[in-house]
């Protein structure tokens, strides 16, 4: 049994890091493998992650972490029974993938303005809370070419757009994702999308 693709990990910089790797053949990850991880810190304890299958030869493990900060560094040991298959390390702050924003809502009752709001996925005491920027994707269900991205570079989790910038009388969907420049993160996954029917009064022409 050998590791074909070494584990690569990303952290949500809150409580979970996800590591993925591939074996050289079909593997029952949860029964045959264990990923041991330990913070390189005084008094830290070793933890064991039981991986799940991710395709025939692929495995994924969700590592639970407390109080994640930029100085943290973890040792990782991948075991198959008594055999050490791979040894590595992981610094969560250098491989951050933020949590996806939630609770995306479209408010259509503001005069001819669409107000999109969503929730910051981090608590106020997490460093990322004040450092997320967002991308909002809006698209038409009827017209695949009607697809747009709005970059939200301010901290408030909201976006206002004129309803007239979208076509009237058709349905649209929106979703939002986040990233943080300070840790050079990847983009988060997209939030679940939300749907609304866009209708507004055409301006009266003289």
């Amino acid at each position: 049994m050998k590791v074909l693709q070494e584990p690569t990990c990303v952290s949500d910089y809150m409580s979970i890091s996800t590591c993925e790797w591939k074996m050289n053949g079909p593997t029952n990850c949860s029964t045959e493998l264990r990923l041991l991880y330990q913070l390189v810190f005084l008094l830290s304890e070793a933890h064991t992650c039981i991986p799940e299958n991710n395709g025939g030869a692929g495995c994924v493990c969700h590592l639970l972490m407390d109080d994640v900060v930029s100085a943290d560094n973890y040792t990782l040991d991948l075991w198959a029974g008594q055999q050490l298959l791979w040894k590595g390390s992981f610094k969560p702050s250098e491989h951050v993938k933020p949590r996806a924003p939630g609770n995306l809502t479209v408010h259509t009752n503001v005069s001819d303005t669409l107000l999109l709001t969503w929730s910051n996925p981090y608590p106020p005491d997490n460093y990322l809370y004040n450092h997320l920027t967002y991308a909002v994707n809006i698209w038409s269900e009827n017209d695949p070419a009607d697809f747009r991205i709005y970059n939200v570079t301010y901290l408030e989790p909201s976006l206002r757009i004129a309803a007239s910038t979208l076509k009237s009388g058709i349905s649209y969907r929106a979703r939002v994702r986040a990233w943080a420049q300070c840790y050079n993160t990847t983009w988060s996954e997209w939030s679940p999308s939300t749907k609304w029917h866009n209708s507004y009064r055409e301006p009266f022409e003289q």
């Epitope: 304890e45 930029s70 100085a71 005491d125």
Partner: antibody, heavy 116, light 111 residues
Framework: QVQLVQSGAEVKKPGASVKVSCKAS????????MHWARQAPGQGLEWMGI????????SYAQKFQGRVTMTRDTSTSTVYMELSSLRSEDTAVYYC?????????WGKGTLVTVSS | QSVLTQPPSVSAAPGQKVTISCSGG????????VSWYQQLPGTAPKLLIY???KRPSGIPDRFSGSKSGTSATLAITGLQTGDEAVYFC????????????FGTGTKLTVL
């Protein structure tokens, strides 16, 4: 919000021991290390040791090795610092502080006076 | 005895800028991150800066931190009378055993 509530002031005789408590609330107790530091009157801060509330293991500054013991009670989310063989130089305000590499939150402090 | 050295005192007028230095060595500041604490008269210390330059939520951006080699600096701009306090730097040292030294402390007086 996070609160670290420390026990009240103590007056002790030289050679005695003192046990200071620090009750934590507003966060997951076993997820954060706890430090202890002290400050003699008009002096700076001095680090004493750290405890991992999850497993209960502790590590102490070399200066206090053999005289200090840090423990925890997960059922009450409380950490304790006991200092033995007290001398007058141990007169200080003793603080618990939550954190790992730095101290996010501090208790208000407990004044321990050692006097004959 | 602290291994992190700070000036005993600094002073400046309201609205001015002041800097406080913290000098250490290769086994502590040089190899770790620096934090800064503010201790107002008669109160417990409060975290002001961590990770060399990050502010906890609620700390105004008048406070900033930096690190270079084995030294660190706390800068306070737009000084206010409420900033009058003692400021301590802190870090950790893993040279022999893990320890968390603090700086000697700097008393800031707002004139």
């Amino acid at each position: 919000q996070v609160q670290l509530v420390q026990s009240g002031a103590e007056v002790k005789k030289p050679g005695a021991s003192v046990k200071v408590s620090c009750k934590a609330s507003g966060y997951a107790f076993t997820s954060y290390y706890m430090h202890w530091a002290r400050q003699a009157p008009g002096q700076g801060l001095e680090w004493m040791g750290i405890i991992n509330p999850s497993g209960g293991s502790a590590s102490y500054a070399q200066k206090f090795q053999g005289r200090v013991t840090m423990t925890r009670d997960t059922s009450t989310s409380t950490v304790y610092m006991e200092l033995s063989s007290l001398r007058s130089e141990d007169t200080a305000v003793y603080y618990c502080a939550r954190g790992k590499y730095w101290m996010y939150d501090w208790g208000k402090g407990t004044l321990v006076t050692v006097s004959s | 005895q602290s291994v992190l050295t700070q000036p005993p005192s600094v002073s400046a007028a309201p609205g001015q800028k002041v800097t406080i230095s913290c000098s250490g060595g290769s086994s502590n500041i040089g190899n770790s991150y620096v934090s800064w604490y503010q201790q107002l008269p008669g109160t417990a210390p409060k975290l002001l800066i961590y990770d060399n330059n990050k502010r906890p939520s609620g700390i105004p951006d008048r406070f900033s931190g930096s690190k270079s080699g084995t030294s660190a600096t706390l800068a306070i701009t737009g000084l206010q009378t409420g900033d009058e306090a003692v400021y301590f730097c802190g870090t950790w040292d893993t040279s022999t055993v893990w320890e968390w030294p603090f700086g000697t402390g700097t008393k800031l007086t707002v004139l």
